[in-house]
């Protein structure tokens, strides 16, 4: 119960930081005009990965797209890949974890196999969180680096007299989402991962009886091999699978592949 | 057609105070901030103030402030400009406006005339 | 607060002439976001409230004839008449649309020779 919900808060985590990578990806607010020098202006400007937006104190906004792809800064670049990489293994992730759900089943799936995607996933949404958090902070280095410059030279003076104002630029909301949706994402692909190991199927550990019953003599040992019967119908040890619900003290936890993310 | 109604001329006594109004026509009211300007006989255009009448968003001139105080009324697609204490000084055409594009004025009532004389 | 000049106060011109007149600004209304000058013209004639010629410093404003032309950037703007009409004969105002508050020039008023 504990590993479906696990499972399921992690998914859904996963789900709501991709959306947000999304949100903040698109977002026209990656950076906006610093104020601080100038709270009188009567024209606001923002940017975002993929346009350049002003804002007039009549309320009318013009956006315009960047057009050029030569032209562009290549931290910009660097941020725009950064950010569709984390939504593509974001949304890959989320696919995959969809049917890796404990809770949903299709055809004869093993738990192995759910076990093994959700860890997939898990990986996905733990990529993805790095790559948008990686994305933000790049851009986020970018703004700080460009905010002292123009503060150096804020004001050029013409003929002594006329100021040019330079515009500075600061965080816009774009980056808190990002950096908050690139969190969520990680924390859920970790859910993902720790959810993974309580699916990972478990070697059944059954106690050591021995009994006598009329005719042959059947022994079960431990370790979850089923000996062989005397009658040589099961020469091979096979490992026996149950699916069932199981009491405290007959499940056994052996270290699997999976135990190490 | 964009039209701006402002109220009749005002003769009032100084330290009284006066409130003028200016009712759109022609769009929806809240589309566009109205502004305020002032013009004294002959002479130049001095900026007061404007109204956003979506959400009664004020920004003031400095030197207008605690002068002028601008309403609106959605419902009467009306926005108000009250001037307190009145002095000769504030003998002028007040003109109401709308702005779009560029933060301009293009479309202007016909003024209000105040006059301040005991 | 911007500080907008306008040169010269009064000009005194004949029908048909090209007429020239500046507005300087104490501060650049350059605004390097969309890269448009936040400067306007009105023209206003006696009696009347102004009317919008040009915004963004060289965009005409609808049903304006093209006689009328603004330019410059920065810190220095020009409205040029190409050929004066009798109907034009006013006084044209600029005005920073830039920051709060916005300022108006004290005006050029064109008379008849």
């Known amino acids: 119960m504990a590993v479906t919900a696990c499972q399921g808060l992690g998914f859904v985590v996963s789900l709501i930081g991709i959306a947000g990578i999304i949100a903040a990806t698109c977002m026209d607010q990656w950076s906006t005009q610093d104020l601080y020098n100038n709270p009188v202006t009567a024209v606001f400007n923002y940017q975002g990965l993929w346009r350049s937006c002003v804002r007039e104190s009549s309320g009318f906004t013009e956006c315009r797209g960047y057009f050029t792809l030569l032209g562009l800064p290549a931290m910009l670049q660097a941020v725009r890949a950064l950010m569709i990489v984390g939504i593509v293994l974001g949304a890959i992730g989320l696919l995959v974890s969809i049917f890796a759900l404990k809770c949903i089943r299709i055809g004869s799936m093993e738990d192995s196999a759910k076990a093994n995607m959700t860890l997939t996933s898990g990986i996905m949404f733990i990529v993805s969180g790095l790559c948008a958090i990686a994305g933000v902070s790049v851009f986020a280095n970018m703004l700080v680096t460009n905010f002292w410059m123009s503060t150096a030279n804020m004001y050029t003076g013409m003929g002594g007299m006329v100021q040019t104002v330079q515009t500075r630029y600061t965080f816009g909301a774009a980056l808190f989402v990002g950096w908050v949706a690139g969190g969520l994402t990680l924390i859920g692909g970790v859910m993902m991962c720790i959810a993974c190991r309580g699916l990972a199927p478990e070697e059944t550990n059954y106690k050591a009886v021995s009994y006598h019953a009329s005719g042959h003599s059947v022994a079960y040992k431990p370790g979850g091999f089923k000996a062989s019967t005397g009658f040589g119908s099961n020469t091979k040890n096979k490992k026996i699978y149950d699916g069932g619900a199981r009491t405290e003290d007959e499940v056994q936890s052996y270290p699997s592949k999976h135990d190490y993310v | 057609e964009v039209q701006l109604q402002q109220s009749v001329p005002e003769l009032v006594k100084p330290g009284a105070s006066v409130r003028m109004s200016c009712k759109a026509s022609?769009?929806?009211?809240?589309?566009?901030?109205i502004q305020w300007v002032k013009q004294k006989p002959g002479q130049g255009l001095e900026w007061i103030a404007y109204i956003n009448p979506y959400n009664d968003d004020t920004k003031y001139n400095e030197k207008f402030k605690g002068k002028a105080t601008l309403t609106s009324d959605k419902s009467a697609s009306t926005a108000y400009m009250e001037l307190s204490s009145l002095t000769s000084e504030d003998s002028a055409v007040y003109y109401c406006?709308?702005?779009?594009?560029?933060?301009?004025?293009?479309?202007w009532g016909q003024g209000t005339l105040v006059t301040v004389s005991a | 607060d911007i500080v907008m000049t306008q040169s010269p106060s009064s000009l005194t011109v004949t029908a048909g002439e090209r007429v020239t007149m500046t507005c300087k600004s104490s501060?650049?209304?350059?605004?390097?976001?969309?890269?448009?000058?936040?400067l306007t013209w009105y023209q206003q004639k006696p009696g009347q409230p102004p009317k919008l010629l040009i915004y963004w410093a060289s965009t005409r404003e609808s049903g304006v004839p093209d006689r009328f032309t603004g330019s410059g950037s920065g810190t220095d703007f020009t409205l040029t008449i190409s050929s004066l009409q009798s109907e034009d004969l006013a006084v044209y105002f600029c005005q920073n649309d830039y920051s709060f508050p916005f300022t108006f020039g004290s005006g050029t008023k064109l008379e008849i020779k």
């Open positions: 501060q650049s209304l350059l605004n390097s976001g969309n890269q448009k000058n936040y």
């Open positions: 022609g769009y929806t009211f809240t589309k566009y901030i």
């Open positions: 406006a709308t702005t779009y594009y560029g933060n301009s004025f293009p479309n």
